[in-house]
């Protein structure tokens, strides 16, 4: 009679993680008489997985049942699959001995890839604000993926960006792999409304691939520009000036208004009103009474944005002129006088 | 070459199961995914959802959960629609796709159609 | 769900005639958009993908261009055995969404 042979016909196997995994193994004969047991791995420092003969192996089933005297389907399967059951599979026949069974053959192995899908990208954008112009980085993080090959785009506003640089970890061989991209962004003022998406591919995926986004409204500073004007009003000495503080984000923003360098009134931003562009437009103004002034005033509006170094626009009131020819607007530094003699009210649009 | 093969027409009562068979060959068929498309008589294409090959999962679009269901033959590379207590408008053509995966998802490879009439 | 709007539902045209057939999408599909063509009785035809991608044995006398939202296809000179339904499909979000289609028939 021919010498029994192991016959494991399947060279590799691919399950998803989560899956039951199948390790097929025959014997040609059943003699010798002695159990059958797998393990993973070869050599001294193989891991047991199986042994017919005795043991707890709470995530093993038989194919076939073992106990039957003709039986030489030796085939198990293996329950919840995760990245950490992949490596060879030996399907190894004992001969029974005294007082220890020893090995007689093994199969050829089996090679269990195990697929798992990578985690939903995370994508972080820079820790401070920044403005138009500049460029800014953003990383995407995926891990726990199996096999290590995958795809990692990143978007912004319809368009695929190409300012990027990716790692896939470990570079040898490994359970599972982890993906880190690092993505270059010029921020516009148009961004308050961008989202910048990172986008993952992998085999396990199929239909839908995984997205993380980053909203560019937590990464933009837009600053605002300002415009001060004077508008007459009825009485023919009072004079309405006011301060347009247009285009900014975020909404944080403190308004001082110095009467020749000295604070008149302070006030935050309250009720603006959003642009399409997802930036903000707000107005102050102060209604002064010309006829309280003997010298020429300097009006300063200040505005402080998002912790910022505050930007200003002045305005001179010729106070010997007539209110209704007066029109200078100026970006002059404050300057310092005491006069206090005007009265004001702010609105807001 | 990729070819997906799908079963013939079906004249069914209102109230019964059809089921409809997708053979696919030339490719390994749990590296993609499997769709499915209603196209109603004289009507444009409706997606109804897909199957991941690989895990089982299935995906409905909205109008089609509940009475339709993916199933798969893994080791026959055959992906099945079966629709249940079928309705007068479930009346259509429905065509299995195979659908891609990395950088490009589209739907490359068709099935030539499975015709469904639904009458009493 | 993202909308796809094709805005003529058929053509008139005449052979050798170039055709432009657009479709605009209710979001940014970041040129995740197919073409397809189907004939009578037929199967659709991928022609497109990645909104300009031009498939393996599509004649080149067909062209995909867009960004964005809006998406156009082109036939440089329109043969006989292009008479066929044109379909967009966007492929960015679950769930897919075709265009209702553009038919073309000869003058």
């Known amino acids: 009679e021919e010498e029994l042979q192991v016959i494991q016909p399947d060279k590799s196997v691919l399950v998803a993680a989560g899956e039951t995994a199948t390790l097929r193994c025959t014997a040609t004969s059943l003699i010798p008489v002695g159990p059958i047991q797998w393990f993973r791995g070869a050599g001294p420092g193989r891991e047991l997985i199986y042994n017919q003969k005795e043991g707890h192996f709470p995530r093993v089933t038989t194919v076939s049942d073992l106990t039957k005297r003709n039986n030489m389907d030796f085939s198990i399967r293996i329950g919840n699959i995760t990245p950490a059951d992949a490596g060879t599979y030996y399907c190894v026949k004992f001969r029974k001995g005294s007082p220890d069974d020893v090995e007689f053959k093994s199969g050829a192995g089996t090679e269990l890839s195990v697929r798992a899908k990578p985690s939903a990208p995370v994508v972080s954008g820079p820790a401070a604000r920044a403005t138009p112009q500049h460029t800014v980085s953003f990383t995407c993080e995926s891990h726990g993926f199996s096999p290590r090959d995958i795809t990692l785009k990143w978007f912004k506003n319809g368009n695929e960006l190409s300012d990027f640089q990716t790692n896939v970890d470990p570079v040898g061989e490994s359970v599972s792999y982890s993906i880190h991209s690092t993505a270059k962004v010029v921020l516009t003022r148009e961004d308050v409304h961008s989202q910048v998406i990172c986008e993952v591919a992998h085999v396990t995926l199929q239909g839908d691939p995984l997205r993380g986004t980053a909203n560019l409204s937590e990464t933009i500073r837009v600053p605002p520009t300002l415009e001060v004007t004077q508008q007459p009003v009825r009485a023919e000495n009072q004079v309405n000036v006011t301060c347009q503080v247009r285009k900014f984000y975020p909404q944080r923003l403190q308004l001082t208004w110095l009467e020749n360098g000295n604070v008149s009134r302070t006030e935050t931003a309250s009720t603006v009103t959003e642009n399409k562009d997802g930036t903000y437009n707000w107005m102050s103004w102060l209604l002064v009474n010309v006829s309280a002034h003997r010298d020429d005033v300097k009006l300063t509006c200040q505005v402080e944005h998002d912790g910022q170094p505050a930007v200003s626009k002045s305005h001179d009131l010729k106070v010997s002129a007539h209110p209704k020819e007066q029109g200078s607007n100026t970006a002059a530094e404050n300057t310092g006088s005491n006069e206090r003699n005007i009265y004001h009210h702010h609105h807001h649009h | 070459q990729i070819q997906l093969v799908q079963s013939g027409p079906e004249l069914k009562k209102p109230g019964e199961t059809v089921k409809i068979s997708c053979k696919a060959s030339g490719y390994t068929f749990t590296d993609y995914a499997m769709h499915w498309v209603k196209q109603a008589p004289g009507k444009g294409l409706k997606w109804m959802g897909w199957?991941?090959?690989?895990?089982?999962?299935?995906t409905y679009a909205e109008d089609f959960k509940g009475r339709f269901a993916f199933f798969l033959e893994t080791s026959a590379s055959t992906a099945y629609l079966q629709i249940n207590n079928v309705k007068n408008e479930d009346t259509a053509t429905y065509f299995c796709?195979?659908?891609?995966?990395?950088?490009?998802?589209?739907?490359?490879?068709w099935g030539q159609g499975t015709s469904v009439i639904v009458s009493s | 769900d993202i909308q796809m709007t094709q805005s003529s539902s058929s053509f008139s045209v005449s052979l050798g005639d170039r055709v432009t057939i657009t479709c605009k999408a209710s979001e940014d599909i970041y040129n995740r958009l197919a073409w397809y063509q189907q004939k009578p009785g037929n199967a659709p035809r991928l022609l497109i993908s990645g909104a300009t991608s031009l498939e393996t044995g599509v004649p080149s006398r067909f062209s995909g261009s867009g960004s964005g939202k809006d998406y156009t296809l082109s036939i440089t000179s329109l043969q006989t055995e292009d008479v066929a339904t044109y379909y967009c499909q966007q492929y960015w979000n679950s769930p897919r969404t075709f265009g209702g289609g553009t038919k073309l028939e000869i003058k």
């Open positions: 199957k991941n090959t690989e895990t089982g999962e299935s």
């Open positions: 796709a195979r659908g891609g995966y990395g950088s490009n998802y589209v739907m490359d490879y």
